[in-house]
């Protein structure tokens, strides 16, 4: 009897109640292996979920995160809250970035915005909550009857902090 | 590898009590703060409570307050999350994290672990 299931391809089930009969999954179940006894329940993607991928006989449904949130855990299994630019998430919701922080994108923590004077530099662009300071020459470049024939440095990329 | 296995989730009836238990493995517990989050049905997470590795300091979201109790057990390597007064409002799907220091608190999320979650259904 076991060897009879055995033959049962994904999409099926091997049904008991006629004779190990491979009978195709009901609507809105799928299975993924052959030699089932039994189908698995569609994941449904509702509410803060969006479907990214419908279920199939052979496979689940994959959800999504709706705009306005983004996924975390396994398959998609939690749906959090972005925040705006200038913001950060913490355990009580979107919280603006202190001032020296900021945030440049919808999740994340806010960083401190780069010391330009550890690079030697000056400040040639202020920072906000949402970008970083642009460093420019150094003050010593920029004081009479220096050449300026090389142009300023670029910003640096901040690191990136871990989620 | 870290594990994060949540049970004791169930349907209650309003102003009913359970407790939820997360059993850890794959990590040194004590050496790490806990913290339970939860998704309500149509709705994105919510933070409920964490607690610092020694169990030492606790925090909970103004929500729960009063209702809700986060505890461990390193010798068992277990987190708790007793809770009573269940209102329909507390219906989701509850989250055991771990997170990636042994101190917290009610401000920064700090996770690096998910479990796979387990339902309450407060309802009548």
């Known amino acids: 009897l076991q060897d009879l299931c055995s033959n049962c391809p994904a999409g099926t089930f091997c049904d008991n109640n006629r004779s190990q009969i491979c009978s195709p999954c009901p609507p809105n179940s799928f299975s993924s292996a052959g030699g089932q006894r039994t189908c698995d329940i569609c994941r449904q993607c509702k509410g803060v979920f969006k479907t990214r991928k419908e279920c199939s006989s052979t496979s689940n449904a994959e959800c999504d995160c709706i705009s306005g949130y983004h996924c975390l855990g396994a398959e998609c299994s939690m749906c959090e809250q972005d925040c705006k630019q200038g913001q950060e998430l913490t355990k009580k919701g979107c919280k603006d970035c202190c001032f020296g922080t900021f945030n440049d994108q919808k999740r994340g923590i806010c960083r401190p915005w780069t010391n330009c004077s550890l690079d030697g530099k000056s400040v040639l662009v202020n920072g906000t909550k949402e970008r970083d300071v642009v460093c420019g020459p150094s003050p010593a470049d920029l004081s009479p009857g220096a050449s300026s024939a090389t142009p300023p440095a670029p910003a640096r990329e901040p690191g990136h902090s871990p989620q | 590898e870290v594990q994060l296995l949540e049970s004791g989730g169930g349907l209650v009836q309003p102003g009913g009590s359970l407790r939820l238990s997360c059993a850890a493995s794959g990590f040194t517990f004590s050496n790490y703060a806990m913290t339970w989050v939860r998704q309500p049905p149509g709705k994105g997470l919510e933070w409920v409570s964490s607690?610092?590795?020694?169990?030492?300091?606790?925090y909970y979201a103004d929500s729960v307050k009063g209702r809700f109790t986060i505890s461990r057990d390193n010798s068992k390597n277990t987190l708790y999350l007793q809770m009573n007064s269940l209102r329909a409002e507390d219906t989701a799907v509850y989250y055991c994290?771990?997170?990636?220091?042994?101190?917290?608190?009610?401000?920064?999320?700090?996770?690096?672990?998910w479990g796979q979650g387990t339902t309450v259904t407060v309802s009548s």
């Open positions: 994290a771990k997170e990636g220091t042994g101190t917290t608190s009610d401000y920064y999320y700090n996770v690096d672990v």
């Open positions: 607690i610092s590795g020694s169990g030492g300091s606790t």
